[in-house]
Interface confidence: low
C-alpha cells in the first residue's frame, strides 16, 4: 500500500537498520526509498523538546509485516517510503537549507558570489554531495562568501547543526544538471587499480556499472566476469574511486571488465532497473519466500509485486512436475545484490522490477522498428505528438515531443500569430491523421514557453515547451523521449531519423501516416558551407544526405530528431528550418538539444 | 538583460487592499533576493519586504499586514498589502539581486529595479 503523507508527532517502534543525518524530513523518505531495505522511517526535528544531538537524525527501518508500532513523541515525522508506490520518484533535491551546517568532509574551500554558484560549483564536482556556504552576513569576517564542497561516505552529511548566516544544500547531478562528462565505455580485459570503497557480487559488467552509477562514492569500477582465474572472485563487481576522479592506474587483465559511474547522465540510462535474466545462473541471498511460479517472467513479476523481494532464482519444473510449475525463490540481502553468485545449476535468476520507476520513463524499451519503408508503424515513435490548432479550422500545425508527462518540446516557430493556447490541441499516440475526430481525446495546453531570446527560426533559440493541462499517462504508443545528457556532447550520434506528418515536397500537403526517414547527421563546418548567407551556431545542428533526397518539410516543424545511442532514444534535435526540401547539399537545420537541456529543466522542474 | 515590471498599484480607501506583482525577465534562474521597497513623496526610499531564499523580512511598519511571496518557476515576487493606511501612500520599486543582501536587510546592495508603481491609500 502506498502512503505518501508523513505522520507528525510520530515515531515507529523497533525495526531500526541505520541511522543518517538530513535536513528535511521529506529528504529522509527519499533517503528510504533509494536505501536497498528500508521500508519505514523516523525523523527528528529540530525542536526545544529533543536533545539537539538527535536533531535531523534519519532512522531507516524495515520490517516483515510493512508496518510498525506508532508511539507518541514531540517532533518526530514519520512515513512511509515510496517503494510502495507507482509513481516516478526522483532523488533530485533543489532545496536550500537556511542556517544548516551539513557536516562531512570539506574537501574544497573557495569563494563564490551566492549560493546559488556554490551548488552549481559543487553540482560540477565529481566527488561533491552537498555544500555548505558562508553568506555575507556570517560573523567570522574570513570565511564570508565561503563555498565549502563536502563529501561522506553514504552521501548524506555526518552530522547536522544550527548554524546563523549560512546556507546549505545538495549536489544537483541527480537532477541532470551537471556539466560532468558521461564516459558510457566499458572497457574489456581492464583492471583499474584504484582504492575500493566497496564490493558487491553482479551477474555482469552493465549490472556492476549501474551499481557504481548509484552508489554515492563510486566513480568507476571493476567487475571479474565468471571467467575469471580467481575462483573467489568471479562476479566480483569493485566500486572505486580516487582523488582525481580519474583511475590512476590501468592493468591490462584477460576476463575483467571497468568502466565509469554514468551519474551525470543517469536520466538518460536505467540505472536502477535491471531487466535481463540471467539463464544457468543462481543467486543466493536471504529467503523471503518460496512460490510456485509458471516461468521466469512470472517468477520475476511476483518479485516486482511484493516489496522487501530485491531478485529471485527461479527453478524451472522437472517434466510433468507440479502441474509443470517450478519453484521461485524470492530473496533479498542488506545491499541489494545477491550474496554469491553460482553457474551450472539450471536456475534463471534476475531482479525485481520495482526499482525501474525510479529511473527516468524515457529508457524503456520501445518496440523494435520496422526497417525500410516511409510510413512508420503504430507504437514506433511514442514520443511523437501531433499539435493542432482550432483556429479558423482545425489542422496540424506542428510535431513534438512528450519529454515528460505534462510537457512537450517543439519549435518556437511553431506559434507564429498563435495568440493563445486555448486554440491548440496536442493528439498523442497518433499514427494517422484520419484517426482525429471530433471526439479524439487531446491534450489541451495550459502554458506556452517559448525561450525568450528567440526572434526567427535561421537566428536560432527555436525551441518552445508546451505545458499541458493534464498529465500524459504513458503507455506503449505514448512515452518520453530522453533529452540527450550534457555529458554527452561528444557523442556521434549514427542511427538518427527524423519523423512528421509534413510535406513529402516542397508543394504538397500534410501526410495521413507518420513519415519517417534516417537521416545523417551533418558537421556545423560542412552544414556552414551549404548557408554561406545563415550563421550555424554551436545551438543548432545539422543532419541530411549531400545528394538530397530525404528531409524534413513544411509541417514537420517541431517534430524530433530522434537518434538511438546505447539502445536509448535521445531527442538530439528539433526541426527548426532550410533551404527547401531535402535539395542536394542544403541539410535540414535543426534546434541542437543539449545545449538547451538546462533551459528545459529550469522550466519544467521549476516548483 | 534584466527587467522588472511592476503591476497592481492603484488608489484604495483605508482598510483596504491591494496586491502587487514583480515580474523578472531575462535571468534564467531564479534570484537569491528579491524585495519591494517604497519611496514616499519627499522622503528617502525605505525597506518594506524581503524575500531571501525562502525566508522572508518585514519593515516593521508593515509586519501582519504585508505578506511577500515569490514564484520561482515565474521569477515573480508578489506584495500583499492589506488594511492599508495613508502612510502607506508612496511608489513602491521591486528589486531582485543574485547575492546575498549586505548585513541590513534593507541596504539598497540590489542589483536591479523596477519602475516602480504608485500606491494611494486615501482617508
Known amino acids: 500500500e502506498c502512503v505518501t503523507q508523513l505522520l507528525k508527532d510520530t515515531c515507529f517502534e523497533g525495526g531500526d537498520i541505520t541511522t543518517v543525518f538530513t535536513p528535511s524530513a521529506k529528504y529522509c523518505q527519499v533517503v528510504c526509498t533509494y536505501h536497498p531495505r528500508c521500508l519505514l522511517f523516523t525523523f527528528t526535528a529540530e525542536s526545544p523538546s529533543e536533545d539537539p544531538t538527535r536533531w535531523f537524525t534519519c532512522v531507516l527501518k524495515d520490517s516483515v509485516t510493512e508496518t510498525l508500532p506508532r508511539v507518541n513523541r514531540t517532533a518526530a515525522i514519520s512515513g512511509y517510503s515510496f517503494k510502495q508506490c507507482s509513481h516516478q520518484i526522483s532523488a533530485c533535491n533543489k532545496d536550500i537549507y537556511v542556517d544548516l551546517d551539513m557536516k562531512g568532509i570539506n574537501y574544497n574551500s573557495s569563494v563564490a558570489k551566492s549560493a546559488q554558484e556554490c551548488q552549481e560549483r559543487c553540482t560540477d564536482d565529481v566527488h561533491c554531495h552537498f555544500f555548505t556556504y558562508a553568506t555575507r552576513q556570517f560573523p567570522s569576517l574570513e570565511h564570508r562568501n565561503i563555498c565549502l564542497l563536502k563529501h561522506t561516505q553514504t552521501g548524506t552529511p555526518t552530522r547536522i547543526t544550527k548554524l546563523d548566516k549560512v546556507v546549505s544544500g545538495f549536489s544537483l547531478k541527480s537532477c541532470a544538471l551537471s556539466n560532468l562528462a558521461c564516459i558510457r565505455d566499458i572497457f574489456p580485459n581492464t583492471v583499474f587499480a584504484d582504492s575500493n570503497i566497496d564490493s558487491v557480487m553482479a551477474p555482469d559488467a552493465f549490472v556492476c556499472g549501474r551499481i557504481c552509477t548509484h552508489h554515492p562514492g563510486c566513480l568507476f569500477f571493476t567487475f571479474f566476469s565468471q571467467e575469471w582465474p580467481k575462483e573467489s572472485q568471479r562476479n566480483l563487481c569493485l566500486l572505486k574511486t580516487s582523488e582525481s576522479g580519474l583511475p590512476s592506474t590501468r592493468i591490462k587483465k584477460s576476463k575483467a571488465l571497468s568502466g565509469f559511474s554514468l551519474q551525470s547522465c543517469r536520466h538518460s540510462i536505467p540505472v536502477f532497473c535491471h531487466s535481463s535474466f540471467y539463464h544457468d545462473t543462481d543467486f543466493l541471498g536471504e529467503e523471503l519466500d518460496i512460490v510456485a511460479a509458471k516461468s521466469h517472467e512470472a517468477c520475476q513479476k511476483l518479485c516486482t509485486n511484493a516489496v522487501r523481494c530485491q531478485f529471485f532464482t527461479y527453478t524451472p519444473a522437472q517434466a510433468s512436475c507440479n502441474e509443470g510449475k517450478g519453484k521461485c525463490y524470492l530473496k533479498l540481502s542488506s545491499n541489494g545484490s545477491p550474496t554469491k553468485i553460482l553457474h551450472g545449476r539450471g536456475g534463471i535468476s534476475g531482479y525485481t522490477l520495482r526499482l525501474c520507476k525510479m529511473d527516468n520513463e524515457c529508457t524503456t524499451k520501445i518496440k523494435p522498428r520496422i526497417v525500410g519503408g516511409t510510413a512508420s508503424v503504430r507504437g514506433e515513435w511514442p514520443w511523437q505528438v501531433t499539435l493542432h490548432t482550432t483556429s479558423p479550422t482545425q489542422r496540424h500545425l506542428c510535431g513534438g515531443s512528450i519529454i515528460g508527462n505534462q510537457w512537450i518540446l517543439t519549435a518556437a516557430h511553431c506559434f507564429y500569430g498563435v495568440e493563445s493556447p486555448k486554440i491548440l490541441r496536442v493528439y498523442s499516440g497518433i499514427l494517422n491523421q484520419s484517426e482525429i475526430k471530433e471526439d479524439t481525446s487531446f491534450f489541451g495546453v495550459q502554458e506556452i514557453i517559448i525561450h525568450d531570446q528567440y526572434k526567427m527560426a535561421e537566428s536560432g533559440y527555436d525551441i518552445a515547451l508546451l505545458k499541458l493541462e493534464t498529465t500524459v499517462n504513458y503507455t506503449d504508443s505514448q512515452r518520453p523521449i530522453c533529452l540527450p545528457s550534457k555529458g554527452d556532447r561528444n557523442v556521434i550520434y549514427t542511427d538518427c531519423w527524423v519523423t512528421g506528418w509534413g510535406y513529402r515536397k516542397l508543394r504538397d500537403k500534410i501526410q495521413n501516416t507518420l513519415q519517417k526517414a534516417k537521416i545523417p547527421l551533418v558537421t556545423n563546418e560542412e552544414c556552414q558551407k551549404r548557408y554561406r548567407g545563415h550563421k550555424i551556431t554551436h545551438k543548432m545542428i545539422c543532419a541530411g544526405y549531400r545528394e538530397g533526397g530525404k528531409d524534413a518539410c513544411k509541417g514537420d516543424s517541431g517534430g524530433p530528431l530522434s537518434c538511438k545511442h546505447n539502445e536509448v532514444w535521445h531527442l538530439v534535435g528539433i526541426t527548426s528550418w532550410g533551404e527547401g526540401c531535402a535539395q542536394r547539399e542544403r541539410p535540414g537545420v535543426y534546434t541542437n538539444v543539449v545545449e538547451y537541456v538546462d533551459w528545459i529543466l529550469e522550466k519544467t522542474q521549476a516548483v | 538583460q534584466v527587467q522588472l515590471v511592476e503591476s497592481g498599484g492603484g488608489s484604495v480607501q483605508a482598510g483596504g487592499s491591494l496586491r502587487l506583482s514583480c515580474a523578472a525577465s531575462?535571468?534564467?534562474?531564479?534570484?537569491?533576493?528579491m524585495g519591494w521597497f517604497r519611496q514616499a513623496p519627499g522622503k528617502e526610499r525605505e525597506g518594506v519586504a524581503v524575500?531571501?531564499?525562502?525566508?522572508?523580512h518585514y519593515a516593521d511598519s508593515v509586519k501582519g499586514r504585508f505578506t511577500i511571496s515569490q514564484d520561482n518557476s515565474k521569477n515573480t515576487v508578489y506584495l500583499q498589502m492589506n488594511s492599508l493606511r495613508a502612510e502607506d501612500t508612496a511608489v513602491y520599486y521591486c528589486?531582485?539581486?543574485?547575492?546575498?543582501?549586505?548585513?541590513?536587510?534593507?541596504?539598497?546592495?540590489?542589483?536591479?529595479w523596477g519602475q516602480g508603481t504608485l500606491v494611494t491609500v486615501s482617508s
Open positions: 528589486a531582485a539581486d543574485l547575492l546575498e543582501y549586505d548585513g541590513t536587510w534593507f541596504g539598497s546592495t540590489y542589483n536591479y
Open positions: 531575462g535571468y534564467t534562474y531564479s534570484f537569491n533576493s
Open positions: 524575500i531571501y531564499l525562502g525566508s522572508t
